[in-house]
């Protein structure tokens, strides 16, 4: 078996990739600068901490993560790392051109940095769905496709709907979900005889994968916490996710031993159960006024995504052609969705508890942005898996689905690698 | 007592460069986000710059955007606003402010500038 | 968004009920501050989040409204209460807008 990249992406995607650094590189020339004022350097070391929490979620919780099919978990992580360093960079100028463009040259800080990690990250949740199935020009297409539609989103929701940074960055989840959920849909789904060993996780890259859980169940409340304006929101924030997270573990690994008809534990499963507690929590992280309630919210959101594991990979797999280990898409899909209703339900309460009319406006506003947030996520991930379709990528065969080899040079050449 | 005072404040010529302090006293600094507010002689008031509280992030109104800078050391409990090719149309007395993040209902914040300075005067004049 | 204020100059008793109003070009839910200032004197936060009383402002002084229509009563007018008020919406993206103020008087 020939590990040769196929002739023709060997030319593509080098031209492809460096053109396009070459092209960002000349727009961060042209347009951007640092910031200049003089900060506090010990408060500067905090904030850049921040970012650093959300780089090693990116690059070591969410590469890690989607390492755990037999052959192809080198170009999981490494393919993350890829579309992490490129969408950062058209992150970081897409943010500037939207929001700062009008005044002149676009100012580089640290919170521009984090929020370019954070739309970066969507791509990385999406990508779940398609890895495996796709070449890094193609890749390097989806990574365009997305941050723009997002940070368009981003930028529109705020206009229209006026809600903080926090808020708009929190429909990621479902944004994510459903881009990726709906590329996956455009691109070929039959698996061919003979290629089904390859979509099966195996004993380390599942451990390589559990590793990559851990990282983002230890940083997911840095991850919720990012953007808020505020300390004491901040606090509340990492407190709630923490909890939430503490008890989806719990949940998930109980769950999935419930779930099992010997009671044995499913590395699967507990690979994102573990993290639903802090998609679920994410959106009214800094709204939920005591833990109970975070703890409750982390125990439904753990048991729906054990559930969901179990009884959603079959229809994901027919329909998306979804390998039963990549369950992010379809995980976060459901768990956004409950962030989404929590965080209307507090709305509500809140609302209420104030003596202040207009709940309805509240919610139709909330509800309104939700619905923008999934239209314009599948919309954009259906023009994306249009784009990926395209002959001139050399998309992988489907034979080579789930395989190392068609990208990486091994000194042997050996299967079981 | 909570306090604020402003200072730097003085007479200058147009295109020159000047540069406020705001210093802060009786409360934790680096916990809030800090304003710059203006008010021309005989007008209204005018948001000019804000700073999130670890100073990871700036606003500016944008008749200043590339022109002044907004900047904090919460070690040493003070708010700057770094004034660069100034214009008649700058004169001002310019204010800091604290913004406070204050609970309404259940557990929804809101916004505020609850504390402020007293002013510095910065006049533009040639 | 936008602030506008109505009336710009308003002629009042002591005693007398006033309303001034505040309307926003879009709507900026409750992220609506209220303050008092008076001549060679910084600005005084009388109400926040729309309706809500700031902690030692007397109970005469009190806010509604949401969205983009927005008021401040003063239900009884005292001699320390002749000033200019403004409304600044403290919503989640700059610019945090000011209204032009009201001047209330002594008629």
């Known amino acids: 078996m020939s590990s040769k990249y196929p002739r023709s992406v060997r030319r593509c995607l080098p031209l492809w990739a460096l053109t396009l650094e070459a092209a960002l590189i000349l727009l961060f020339y042209f347009f951007t600068h640092y910031d200049a004022s003089l900060e506090d350097q010990k408060g500067l070391v905090a904030s850049y901490q921040v970012g650093q929490d959300l780089t090693v979620m990116a690059a070591i919780g969410l590469g890690f993560l989607t390492s755990s099919f037999r052959r192809h978990s080198w170009s999981s992580v490494a393919f993350n790392l890829f579309m992490l360093a490129l969408g950062v960079q058209w992150a970081i100028l897409l943010d500037g051109f939207l929001s700062q463009f009008p005044s002149g040259k676009v100012v580089i800080t640290l919170f521009s940095i984090r929020l370019a990690t954070m739309s970066a990250l969507s791509v990385l949740i999406s990508v779940d769905a398609v890895l495996g199935k796709v070449n890094l020009a193609q890749l390097v297409v989806m990574v365009l496709v997305e941050v723009t539609a997002l940070g368009n989103l981003r930028m529109v929701i705020s206009n229209i709907f006026n809600t903080d940074y926090h808020m708009n960055m929190m429909h990621i989840y479902v944004f994510a979900a459903y881009f990726g959920l709906s590329v996956a849909w455009c691109l070929p789904k039959p698996l061919p005889e003979g290629t089904e060993d390859k979509d099966q996780t195996a004993t380390i890259p599942s451990l390589s994968a559990m590793l990559g859980a851990l990282f983002l169940w230890m940083f997911w409340p840095s991850f919720n916490s990012a953007l808020l304006r505020s300390p004491i929101e901040r606090k509340n924030a990492v407190f709630n996710t923490y909890y939430a997270v503490a008890v989806s573990v719990v949940t998930a690994i109980s769950g999935s031993s419930l779930a099992h008809p010997q009671g044995k534990i499913s590395k699967t499963y507990v690979h994102s159960a573990v993290l639903a507690g802090g998609v679920a929590v994410g959106t009214s992280c800094h709204l939920i006024p005591s833990p109970w309630l975070a703890m409750v919210l982390g125990l439904v959101a753990g048991l729906i995504s054990v559930g969901g594991a179990k009884y959603l990979p079959g229809c994901c797999n027919r329909v998306l052609g979804i390998p039963h280990s990549s369950i992010m898409g379809y995980n976060f899909s459901l768990l956004g969705l409950l962030g989404e209703i929590i965080y209307i339900v507090l709305l509500v309460l809140d609302t209420v508890g104030a003596g202040n009319g207009m709940i309805g406006f509240q919610v139709l506003l909330s509800i309104g942005e939700l619905s923008l947030a999934i239209v314009i996520a599948l919309m954009s991930g259906l023009l994306t898996g249009l784009l990926l379709n395209l002959k001139i990528w050399k998309a992988p065969h489907e034979a080579k689905y789930f395989d190392d080899q068609v990208f990486w040079k091994f000194p042997h050449l050996a299967v079981g690698f | 007592e909570v306090q604020l005072l402003e200072s730097g404040g003085g007479v200058v010529q147009p295109g020159r460069s000047l540069r406020l302090a705001c210093a802060a006293s009786g409360f934790s600094f680096r916990s809030y986000g800090m304003h710059w507010v203006r008010q021309a002689p005989g007008r209204g008031l005018e948001w000019v710059a804000f700073?999130?509280?670890?100073?990871?992030?700036?606003y500016y109104v944008d008749s200043v955007k590339g022109r002044f800078t907004i900047s904090r050391d919460n070690s040493k409990n003070t708010l700057y606003l770094e004034m660069n090719s100034l214009r008649v149309d700058d004169t001002a007395v310019y204010y800091c402010?604290?913004?406070?993040?204050?609970?309404?209902?259940?557990?929804?914040?809101?916004?505020?500038?609850?504390?402020w300075g007293p002013g510095t005067t910065v006049t533009v004049s040639s | 968004a936008e602030l506008t204020q109505s009336p710009s100059f308003l002629s009042a008793s002591v005693g007398d009920r006033v309303t001034i109003t505040c309307r926003a070009s879009q709507g900026i839910r409750s992220y609506l501050a209220w303050y008092q200032q008076k001549p060679g004197k910084a600005p005084k936060l009388l109400i926040y989040?729309?309706?809500t009383l700031q902690s030692g402002v007397p109970s005469r002084f009190s806010g509604s409204g949401s969205g983009t229509e927005f008021t401040l009563t003063i239900s009884s007018l005292q001699p320390e209460d002749f000033a200019t008020y403004y409304c600044q919406q403290l919503n989640n993206y700059p610019p945090f807008t000011f209204g032009p103020g009201t001047k209330v008087d002594i008629k």
């Open positions: 989040a729309a309706s």
């Open positions: 402010a604290r913004e406070a993040s204050m609970l309404r209902g259940i557990s929804r914040y809101y916004y505020a500038m609850d504390v």
């Open positions: 700073t999130w509280f670890d100073g990871s992030n700036k």
